[in-house]
Each structure stands twice: as structure tokens, then as C-alpha cells.
Amino acid sequence: APVPPGEDSKDVAAPHRQPLTSSERIDKQIRYILDGISALRKETCNKSNMCESSKEALAENNLNLPKMAEKDGCFQSGFNEETCLVKIITGLLEFEVYLEYLQNRFESSEEQARAVQMSTKVLIQFLQKKAKNLDAITTPDPTTNASLLTKLQAQNQWLQDMTTHLILRSFKEFLQSSLRALRQM
């Protein structure tokens, strides 16, 4: 399910429960995706020892995964709500091709991988409603994404395992960073 439990119509209709605010819905959605990533990481970490390797040992890769930096306005120092929101949405849009790559990369967690992908699409929609400056958000080029996907899928098994691990770790960190920032907004 792309939306966490407690979000469906019958649940919202419960008389004792206040409907979630936009911020609460976004917060819950991110936590739901992070839980999904956690389950996927369990499978990848059980298959290889990459999770124990230091970041430096895995840093040499050609992946251009989105990453938060000081200039993005999402950190405590130099916090800027509007700049940060644009970065979060742009970053999530850039992650979509990598989430597509993750499909078919899992044996026992195939549905979980799909749920993470679909939930991220829903999260982007929630955030786009919150953003005022939608013009500043650049959407990745579909042709570039298609060729990147082809290239990633053509890698040997070891590199594919490494890529899977790096995507999950980077996406987790990006979402955690986004959550910290959104909770300050």
C-alpha cells in the first residue's frame, strides 16, 4: 500500500480520531517509507557484508545520488524553509529512477520494494501541495533516466548488489534529513 495504515477512508471516518494535518500526513508518510527501506536493507545486509563496510570503502561509485548539503537550507544552521522544500522535492524526483532500479532486485521483499516506490510518489504529491515555489523544481529528463537505468541494469552482479546497498542507504539518509527539516517547518 502506498499510504500508511490509518490513512484509508474508513479509518479517517472513525469518530474519535482527528483528521491528520498536511504536516502530520507528510511526517507519517516518510516514516512509513523509512520502515519499508529498513525491511529492504535487512534483506540486502543478510546477503552481503556491505552494510558493515565503511562509507569510504564504498564511496568510489559513479552514482549521482541526491544528497543534502549546507547550501540546501535543510540543516539547522542556515535553515531556509522554501529552499529546503524545493531541495526535498527535487531530490525525491531524482531518486525515482533509482527506486525503479530497485524493482526486481529483491526476492522475498518484492512487494516492499514496490510499496517504497509507490509511497514515494504519494509523498512527492503531498510535498508539491505544500510548496509555494513549484517553478524552482526541476524534473529529471526521462531520456537521461532511461539510459541510466539501462546502464545500471547492465552491471555485473557484485556491482548491482553494491548499487542496491548504496541506493537504500542514501535514500534512508535523505529521508531522515528531510524529516528533521520538515519537523522544523
Partner: antibody, heavy 120, light 110 residues
Framework: EVQLVESGGGLVQPGGSLRLSCAAS????????MTWVRQAPGKGLEWVGM???????AYANSAIGRFTISRDNSKNTLYLQMNSLRAEDTAVYYC??????????????WGQGTLVTVSS | DIQMTQSPSTLSASVGDRVTITCQAS??????LSWYQQKPGKAPKLLIY???TLASGVPSRFSGSGSGTEFTLTISSLQPDDFATYYC????????????FGGGTKVEIK
């Protein structure tokens, strides 16, 4: 053995500076979020600051502008640079490892602490 | 900013007693709360996280409950080793705060 060992504490004059170190062993520091917590003599625990994955940091109000957390992944060591020290900064300083697996901060591995005394 | 208020600050109890410590957050923190035990001259030890999940190696006499702003740590039957100071800690947001920890509760022998 998985452990954290703090060092660098001591006596320093008000207005002075000090750099604390926290050496990690048995795990790679770069894979975890790390925090500093302090405890004044006879008082409770006080969170000081945190360093996240992409060198993002967060600080308690009392530490903003005076304290800086950094790490050297090649040395597997965490640092706390403390400037403009005041008498109220006197405390045992602990470094701790955050679980990092989820979104909420929780500290599941602690060092033994190092005492910082700010006095003239 | 989020403030954590713990009560009582001191609690006198006997071995075998059921002990309850409460922690209140100034705003909702979901279930993002941890409990720690600290003995004199020692570093704190994580007991419970996510409000109710027992940390590895922690005896089952310890339990946690609560969500939103009200949380409880319960020791079902106090043991000699449990006389210590207990702290709650919010993990929801570490920005613009004075402290993530509650003021502490000292559990002493009656």
C-alpha cells in the same frame, strides 16, 4: 570489542577552548550518527549536539555558536571543539552512538566520559 | 522547542515494589521516546526505545508505554540492582531545544 573512549578533558579557564576526542573501535564511525551528552556534577543529563551522515549537525541552544562537532573517519574519531567556555560548562562529557537505523534519536552505546572543569 | 518533564524527581521504594515513572513532552512526539538507567559514576544505559520496545539484554520487568505527550516507565518488581536514576529522552526533534532529556528520577531505598 565495540566501544567508545573519550579523552581531552581537563581544567580550562573561563573564555578558553578545549577539544574533546572520542575514539571508536569495533565499528566504523562513518556508518553511524554520533552525539555528545554532558552531565554537570550532581545534575541530570544534558544533550549537547549530534552529527549525522552527511556532516549535518544539530546543537542544543546552549551550544550553538560555541561548540562544533566533527569527525575524522580515517581515524575513526569524533570530536567536540568547545570555545568561549563558561563555568556552567563544567561537566562529564560523554560521546554516544545513535542507533541510526530509524528516524528517532536513541543512544545505544556510550563512552565512559571525560571531565571538563572550567575555573579560574 | 520541546521540553521534557519527568516526575517524580525522587522515589523511595522497597525491593519487590511496582514502580512507575512518568514523562511528559510539551508537544506530541509520537512514540519517539527512550528511557535510560544511570548508576553513580557510570554512563547511562539504554533500557527502552520507541516508548515500549525493550533494548537488548534488558530484563522483562522493565516496560514502557505511552504515545503523543504522556509516557510511563514501569518496573514490575523492583530488584536491588534497579536502584538508580532514570531519564527519559525525546528523539523526535533535536533542533531549537534546551535539552532532549527529562530531569531524571532517582529511585532510592525506602
Amino acid at each position: 570489542e565495540v566501544q567508545l573512549v573519550e579523552s581531552g578533558g581537563g581544567l580550562v579557564q573561563p573564555g578558553g577552548s578545549l577539544r574533546l576526542s572520542c575514539a571508536a573501535s569495533g565499528f566504523s564511525l562513518s556508518n553511524y550518527y554520533m552525539t555528545w551528552v554532558r552531565q554537570a556534577p550532581g545534575k541530570g543529563l544534558e544533550w549537547v549536539g549530534m552529527i549525522y551522515g552527511s556532516d549535518e549537525t544539530a546543537y542544543a541552544n546552549s551550544a550553538i555558536g560555541r561548540f562544533t562537532i566533527s569527525r575524522d573517519n580515517s581515524k575513526n574519531t569524533l570530536y567536540l571543539q568547545m570555545n568561549s567556555l563558561r563555568a556552567e560548562d563544567t561537566a562529564v562529557y560523554y560521546c554516544a552512538r545513535d542507533d541510526s537505523s530509524d528516524w528517532d534519536a536513541k543512544f545505544n552505546l556510550w563512552g565512559q566520559g571525560t571531565l571538563v572543569t572550567v575555573s579560574s | 522547542d520541546i521540553q521534557m518533564t519527568q516526575s517524580p524527581s525522587t522515589l523511595s521504594a522497597s525491593v519487590g515494589d511496582r514502580v512507575t515513572i512518568t514523562c511528559q513532552a510539551s508537544q506530541s512526539i509520537n512514540n519517539e521516546l527512550s528511557w535510560y538507567q544511570q548508576k553513580p559514576g557510570k554512563a547511562p544505559k539504554l533500557l527502552i526505545y520507541r516508548a515500549s520496545t525493550l533494548a537488548s539484554g534488558v530484563p522483562s520487568r522493565f516496560s514502557g508505554s505511552g504515545s503523543g505527550t504522556e509516557f510511563t516507565l514501569t518496573i514490575s518488581s523492583l530488584q536491588p540492582d534497579d536502584f538508580a536514576t532514570y531519564y527519559c529522552q525525546q528523539g523526535y526533534s533535536l533542533r531549537n531545544i534546551d535539552n532532549a532529556f527529562g530531569g531524571g528520577t532517582k529511585v532510592e531505598i525506602k
